[in-house]
């Protein structure tokens, strides 16, 4: 007998993170075999989109010619085959950016820091908000994510840094969003470059449009060292 | 620096296969979207396939059914296979990685590529 | 599948004129779109991507613009070094189709 029919690939063009109102393409690569494709959305009525496959069989395409807070969530495709319907892939997660406006980024003391002091970024937004992300350009994904212990919403967060190195320095951006849907965030922040003087190492930034965040997962964020802000949020690793 | 190598033969005949290996350095091919591209001699820019790191694939459909773009993650390299050549299939053949996403700009466009090797297709 | 044509496809300008090059596609993309500098002889180089922001290192004359269908490539002030031909790419969706170029020379 034979096994389970292998689980496809499932990935998003151009990427899984878009801005509102852009497009985006939903690919699921299966087998030559496959004669129909079916992609599920997490809290939605399955299936969510069924497509037959594109020559030469082994790959459908499911398309969202503009972004919105409908389309935000985790993914999964299957396809069936004479003998049946696969595993299911891998999860995708499709984040939405520009769900809320953005919020103020902001250094204390001040952004330029000297290697071994202490410096926090302060994420700051108009309306108050249970979840802040701090992510920095290069890493592939957000360095901190804090959330209310309690479902409290806040107006900030606070991410500590200490003792800075020169690793630390490079450009930041925050982002706010709720908790009922991790899948929604808002608009970036401006960017804030974080310069760290005294190092052995050059601790000239790079220009902000030169940084370059990877497409997949197994760049590792860079991790700031500190203690847990006294914010009433507590810091989750991602 | 990341940076991108073509290699290959340079001549091949009528009806063969034309096989080529872009070998990724200073950086890791497990991320982003790897492509190859040609250009004939005097003419454009023509995209003749992706392979995704998960070895996820999309080519160009006037290419497709001879097309096989392959990634070999323990050698960083990714390879081109073009069967059924002919002498249309002459030009330099350029690998290139279209780059990641910026949270404040977006999507790159391909920010690095090979310098390029050129394939003849001849008897 | 989703054509990229570019127009004109070649121009001759003076040194220090503005220079536009336009490229249209036959339907959305969105902000999908880099375009492309390539000299006499040598590799493509990215000059913008996201429609509008120019890649590192490269000059502040050259600006693009554009979202959907319709995307400009400007070059403020055309200096000698710039004579090269210029592609446009989609990347919203396979297949990432290019523009046929435009060749730009100087007057």
């Known amino acids: 007998q034979a096994g389970p029919l292998p689980k496809p690939t499932l990935w998003a063009e151009p990427g899984s993170v878009i801005s509102w109102g852009n497009s985006v393409t939903i690919w699921c690569q299966g087998t030559l075999e496959a004669r129909e494709y079916r992609l599920d959305k997490e809290e939605s009525p399955a299936p969510w989109d069924r497509q037959n496959p594109l020559e030469p069989k082994n790959k459908a395409r499911f398309s969202i010619p503009s972004m919105t807070e409908d389309y935000a969530g985790r993914y999964r495709c299957y396809y069936r085959s004479p003998v049946g319907w696969s595993q299911p892939s891998d999860p995708l997660e499709l984040v939405m950016t520009g769900a809320y406006s953005k919020p103020t980024l902001s250094a204390l003391p001040s952004p330029l820091v000297t290697s071994g002091k202490s410096v926090t970024l302060l994420c700051q937004s108009r309306s108050p908000m249970d979840t802040f992300l701090l992510i920095k350009e290069r890493a592939a994904h957000p360095l901190l994510h804090l959330r209310s212990e309690h479902g409290a919403q806040q107006h900030q967060a606070e991410f500590p840094m200490s003792p800075v190195t020169s690793v630390h320095g490079g450009t930041y951006r925050c982002f706010s969003s709720h908790g009922f849907s991790h899948y929604l965030l808002s608009h970036p922040s401006d960017p804030l470059e974080l310069i760290v003087s005294g190092s052995l190492e050059d601790p000239r930034p790079s220009p902000t449009r030169s940084v370059s965040t990877a497409a997949g997962p197994e760049d590792q964020p860079l991790m700031p060292t500190g203690s847990v802000p006294h914010s009433g949020l507590r810091r989750h690793w991602e | 620096q990341v940076q991108l190598q073509e290699s290959g033969p340079g001549l091949v005949k009528p009806s063969e296969t034309l096989s080529l290996t872009c070998t990724v350095s200073?950086?890791?091919?497990?991320?982003?979207?790897w492509s190859w591209i040609r250009q004939p001699p005097g003419k454009g820019l023509e995209w003749i396939g992706y392979?995704?790191?998960?070895?996820?694939?999309n080519y160009n459909p006037s290419l497709k059914s001879r097309v096989t773009i392959s990634v070999d993650t323990s050698k960083n390299q990714f390879s081109l296979k073009l069967s059924s050549v002919t002498a249309a299939d002459t030009a330099v053949y350029y690998c290139?990685?279209?780059?990641?996403?910026?949270?404040?700009?977006?999507?790159?466009?391909?920010?690095?590529w090979g310098q390029g090797t050129t394939v003849t297709v001849s008897s | 599948d989703i054509q990229m044509t570019q127009s004109p496809s070649s121009l001759s300008a003076s040194v220090g004129d503005r220079v536009t090059i336009t490229c249209r596609a036959s339907?959305?993309?969105?902000?999908?779109l880099a375009w492309y500098q390539q000299k006499p002889g040598k590799v493509p180089k990215l000059l913008i991507y996201?429609?509008?922001t120019l890649q590192s290192g490269v000059p502040s004359r050259f600006s693009g613009s554009g979202s959907g269908t319709d995307f400009t490539l400007t070059i403020s002030s055309l200096q000698p070094e710039d004579v090269a031909t210029y592609y446009c790419?989609?990347?919203?969706?396979?297949?990432?189709?290019f523009g046929q170029g435009t060749k730009l020379e100087i007057k």
């Open positions: 290139a990685r279209r780059g990641g996403y910026s949270y404040g700009y977006g999507y790159y466009g391909m920010d690095v």
């Open positions: 392979i995704y790191y998960s070895g996820s694939t």
């Open positions: 790419q989609k990347y919203n969706s396979a297949p990432w189709t």
């Open positions: 339907q959305g993309i969105s902000n999908y």
């Open positions: 996201a429609a509008s």
């Open positions: 200073g950086g890791s091919i497990s991320s982003y979207f």
